[in-house]
């Protein structure tokens, strides 16, 4: 079977600063030199793209400057960080990996990571 398997953690809790990190690991059926990683958010049956980056194997992956994601790659493993999260962003975040080059193309979709985001309590007013 030449399908591509993608593994990611089931649950992650965002930090109080609204930052969540998780590892997306894929078992490559081919020798890809160009890989695209996309983070998707699934809410109900709607799927939206959160961020995407293409990288050459052996190089760092680079998200667009205005992206809420950052990441590093090592072999078939990508460490993803999503920032600026708020409680309303709690949901299922799916790691999608595509082997873009050389042909053939392969698609891999993880089962998703449920990211829980809790907004920090506002600081109480002080008289100082």
């Amino acid at each position: 079977c030449k399908a591509m398997h993608v593994a990611q953690p089931a649950v992650v809790l965002a930090s109080s600063r609204g930052i969540a990190s998780f590892v997306c690991e894929y078992a490559s059926p081919g020798k890809a030199t160009e890989v695209r990683v996309t983070v998707l958010r699934q809410a109900d049956s709607q799927v939206t793209e959160v961020c995407a980056a293409t990288y050459m194997m052996g190089n760092e992956l680079t998200f667009l400057d205005d992206s809420i994601c950052t990441g590093t790659s090592s072999g078939n493993q990508v460490n993803l960080t999503i920032q600026g999260l708020r409680a309303m962003d709690t949901g299922l975040y799916i790691c999608k990996v595509e082997l873009m080059y050389p042909p053939p193309y392969y698609l891999g979709i993880g089962n998703g990571t449920q990211i829980y985001v809790i907004d920090p309590e506002p600081c109480p007013d002080s008289d100082f």
Epitope: C1, A3, L40, V47, E98, P104, Y105, Y106, I109
Partner: antibody
């Protein structure tokens, strides 16, 4: 709402060329892989080619490799298929198709008929 | 290349009956990458099922998909008059993306 509208089909002689276009609207074009799928009269569906995202990566069916070129212009939200050295067996309705974020083919144009005949 | 085979080629049934369509792959296909499409004469195909079992937007719940590995099934629980059409399975996990030859569901 998502719309895909093909144009450029017609009758052409064997060995000649034709260029199909597909105007897309209602979605962020550059975030999606775009495909051409064809259907010969009375036959099933055959995937032809795909162009990904920024247009740098393309994949083709063996039956059209070296003769057809898929491309896209993200600034115009338009997909193209340049068809050279056409053969009688290329006669088909050609559909422009969006590959959704999870990979399946979720939106199809109405199709444009290409007839290769002398 | 993954070759998909569909059976039966034609299924003759009456409205209200249950339709069971089969799709078999030449090698294992992850269920995440198997779709079903419906096509009526003179129309473009329409996505019914993706990921082997998830209904596309707006698809009635009488349509359901199942299966894994090399064997997949599309079931229409009670055929409505508008369901008589040709149904194609497809794998989209690797290129070349391939379709089955189709199953025609016609009125008995």
């Amino acid at each position: 709402q998502v719309q895909l509208v093909e144009s450029g089909g017609g009758v052409v002689q064997p060995g000649r060329s034709l260029r199909l276009s597909c105007a897309a609207s209602g979605f962020t074009f550059s975030s999606y892989g775009m495909h051409w799928v064809r259907q010969a009269p009375g036959k099933g569906l055959e995937w032809v080619a795909v162009v990904w995202y920024d247009g740098n990566n393309k994949h083709y069916a063996d039956s059209v490799k070296g003769r057809f070129t898929i491309s896209r212009d993200n600034s115009k939200n338009t997909l193209y298929l340049q068809m050279n050295s056409l053969r009688a067996e290329d006669t088909a309705v050609y559909y422009c198709v969006r590959g959704d974020l999870l990979g399946s083919f979720d939106y199809w144009g109405q199709g444009t008929l290409v007839t290769v005949s002398s | 290349e993954i070759v998909l085979t569909q059976s039966p080629g034609t299924l003759s049934l009456s409205p209200g009956e249950r339709a069971t369509l089969s799709c078999r792959a030449s090698q294992s296909v992850s269920s995440s990458y198997l779709a079903w499409y419906q096509q009526k004469p003179g129309q473009a195909p329409r996505l019914l099922i993706y990921g082997a079992s998830s209904r596309a937007t707006g698809i009635p719940d009488r349509f359901s998909g199942s299966g894994s590995g090399t064997d997949f099934t599309l079931t229409i629980s009670r055929l409505e008059p508008e369901d008589f059409a040709v149904y194609y399975c497809q794998q989209y996990g690797s290129s070349p993306f391939t379709f089955g030859p189709g199953t025609k569901v016609d009125i008995k």
